[in-house]
Amino acid sequence: EVEKTACPSGKKAREIDESLIFYKKWELEACVDAALLATQMDRVNAIPFTYEQLDVLKHKLDELYPQGYPESVIQHLGYLFLKMSPEDIRKWNVTSLETLKALLEVNKGHEMSPQVATLIDRFVKGRGQLDKDTLDTLTAFYPGYLCSLSPEELSSVPPSSIWAVRPQDLDTCDPRQLDVLYPKARLAFQNMNGSEYFVKIQSFLGGAPTEDLKALSQQNVSMDLATFMKLRTDAVLPLTVAEVQKLLGPHVEGLKAEERHRPVRDWILRQRQDDLDTLGLGLQGGIPNGYLVLDLSMQEALS
């Protein structure tokens, strides 16, 4: 808190310029009018105010706008944004994507901070949904952004926004998140032809049901093992050996290296050993020949 002292003669600021950098904290407080500061915020970003002076400038803006800063001020905060607390940011109403970009730029190259998370939350809530332009912007600055959202939050993502998602944006998503995103991706890419469709949908397949995997197996997609290992176990289990062979194409040989890991391990346990032997990979652990398999879950569903 800066003491209230009178501005020395001749030091009253007429405009926000570089000469203010040499003002002491108390001089800055006494000689810079908060309204002048607010109208000339575009200059503040261009002037390398000292660490202590930024505190004074924030204090002046807080006094002028106790209910929260207007967007005309927010978009020019620059480094001053890094002096804000999440509580400060919760008072803001940010509607312009340009403002959001300007503030994300200040924090670029660093992990998402509580301030940035609050800013994004305010922005998205204000828009009502996570539209394509916003998603484009957020994933450009924070590739992991999408996977930081809850399944409930992801449900507000319109299918059209899925076009903005890059494979690396989904790296840290868990199956619950992919369950929400996959149907949106399927809808978004539905008019693409087979090979193009697979390239786009591949990153989302961790949320695909069995019937979609069966359909893909008929399209010569040659799914790689990394993608296969991320599929839902419950979606993989009902696939036949022939279907998995068609799904993986030349990559089927990779099953041997993964035979102890889910979902491959669990899938092997569900296949007849005879069928597994047709792959010629030496996969072991299938159902021995002559054994009868009862699908109890099917029986329960019928009763």
Partner: nanobody, 119 residues
Amino acid sequence: EVQLVESGGGLVQAGGSLRLSCAASGSTSSINTMYWYRQAPGKERELVAFISSGGSTNVRDSVKGRFTISRDNSKNTLYLQMNSLRAEDTAVYYCNTYIPYGGTLHDFWGQGTLVTVSS
């Protein structure tokens, strides 16, 4: 984290020259503007000069024409060339910068180097 170490201070006669250096280490890629401050005995600390990452500089009126600030980014070093020194320039000179990290700004200071100008 940024570490700042000043050197180059000492005793000099009025009218003489000194060149102060400030070696920066640590997260130097995040450094934008760098500052020289000074604190004379019994007085509050004041800003002497600054230089932005783009190279634009400014010095306070009382040292204009006598002091020059510069930096060598390849050596991560900040300089203050002080000519025509006066008794009133006697002070501890500090180098300072701040960087964004973890969503906030972090302020870093050197330990200071003493400049004594004898008349």
